[in-house]
């Protein structure tokens, strides 16, 4: 069965947009006007995972690219990366665990928890133009809350 997907953009709680920074990295910065066209459009796919009444498992691909956000250990630390996949096989309903994020909605804000590394979240820095990363703390300096904008 074709996996159900939607197209969207994400902004962090400081209203920073996400853009490509080199071929395999995202960064977060404030964009206005025509510059908003630089922001990445995600293809969010609804996949199998440890779903609960509060958490919906999703995979986050980049629209029209064979790149997915994935979570792996690098130097013994959970790390967010953009991983290249075979477009013939992705997206699929049974994504490998490293590609799966638990989408959590709290007070109209979204968090994305790694399924592979519980309590690690897609995060941005307070500072401008810093890489999007996997962070192990909520409610601290780093930002783990996002809003989603649907794209047709």
């Amino acid at each position: 069965a074709p996996v159900r997907s939607l197209h969207c953009t994400l902004r962090d709680a400081q209203l920073k947009s996400l853009v490509m920074s080199g071929p395999y990295e995202l960064k977060a910065l404030h964009l206005q006007g025509q510059d908003l066209e630089q922001q990445v459009v995600f293809s969010m796919s609804f996949v199998q995972g440890e779903e609960s009444n509060d958490k919906i498992p999703v995979a986050l691909g980049l629209k029209a690219k064979n790149l997915y956000l994935s979570c792996v250990l690098k130097d013994d630390k959970p790390t967010l990366q953009l991983e290249s996949v075979d477009p013939k096989n992705y997206p699929k309903k049974k994504m490998e665990k490293r590609f799966v994020f638990n989408k959590i909605e709290i007070n109209n804000k979204l968090e994305f928890e790694s399924a592979q590394f519980p309590n690690w979240y897609i995060s941005t820095s307070q500072a401008e133009s810093m890489p999007v990363f996997l962070g192990g703390t909520r409610g601290g300096q780093d930002i783990t809350d996002f809003t989603m904008q649907f794209v047709s």
């Epitope: 069965a1 199998q48 440890e50 609960s52 958490k55 309903k93 049974k94 519980p118």
Partner: antibody
Framework: EVQLQESGPGLVKPSETLSLTCTVS????????VSWIRQPPGKGLEWLGL???????YYNSPLKSRLTISKDTSKSQVSLKLSSVTAADTAVYYC????????????????WGQGTLVTVSS | DIQMTQSPSSLSASVGDRVTITCQAS??????LNWYQQKPGKAPKLLIS???TLPPGVPSRFSGSGSGTDFTFTISSLQPEDFATYYC?????????FGQGTKLEIK
């Protein structure tokens, strides 16, 4: 060897809370989810909900407001609480281990307890 | 929620017969379908996972096939111990849903 065993009172009064325990062995509740299923006398199977290894829960919509599933990993026990029971909640209640195989059969159930009959009556 | 329609609801057969039970899903569930056998007063036992896979220890007279929305469970040659009720379960999406069951009786 994987085993699950349900226990709890066989009789509950209407409007009270039904409480059951599922004690497991042969696997860790840190690694595997456990589902609860019930079967009214002479009827089919109804899936109630589950608790994952992480402790996150999913409750089937019709029972969501009355159902609580929790666990004590150190005791290898999963508990089910169903509040405000009526005669319609009379059933054999089963717990079952989730297959939990990512990318293959994440949601299936492979081992079941023998079940415990709960009658709701005054 | 995904609805599972199982048929027939009951079936009479003799030892040695070939028996087929079907299950239809209300939407495409790939191969995420399990079959269980339940004897009176006992818990369901897994016979087939992922539409066609036999767990260790399940006799080879049991088989399953299908994908998408239409699934079949077959007992190639009925044995006396096979008289029981059989259920399909979709394990594709939560909430999990069962078929209504098929009671297999001795003719």
């Amino acid at each position: 060897e994987v085993q699950l065993q349900e226990s709890g009172p066989g009789l509950v009064k209407p409007s009270e809370t039904l409480s059951l325990t599922c004690t497991v062995s042969g696997f860790s509740l840190r690694d595997y989810g456990v589902s609860w299923i019930r079967q009214p006398p002479g009827k089919g199977l109804e899936w109630l909900g589950l608790i994952w290894g992480s402790g996150d829960t999913y409750y089937n919509s019709p029972l969501k407001s009355r159902l609580t599933i929790s666990k004590d990993t150190s005791k290898s026990q999963v508990s089910l609480k169903l509040s405000s029971v009526t005669a319609a909640d009379t059933a054999v209640y089963y717990c079952a281990k989730q297959t939990n195989i990512w990318g293959y059969d994440l949601y299936g159930m492979d081992y079941w307890g023998q079940g415990t009959l709960v009658t709701v009556s005054s | 929620d995904i609805q599972m329609t199982q048929s027939p609801s009951s079936l009479s057969a003799s030892v040695g017969d070939r028996v087929t039970i079907t299950c239809q899903a209300s939407q495409d569930i790939d191969m995420d379908l399990n079959w269980y056998q339940q004897k009176p007063g006992k818990a369901p036992k897994l016979l087939i996972s992922q539409a066609n896979t036999l767990p260790p220890g399940v006799p080879s007279r049991f088989s399953g096939s299908g994908s998408g929305t239409d699934f079949t469970f077959t007992i190639s040659s009925l044995q006396p111990e096979d008289f029981a009720t059989y259920y399909c379960l979709q394990s594709d999406w939560l909430p999990l849903t069962f078929g209504q069951g098929t009671k297999l009786e001795i003719k």
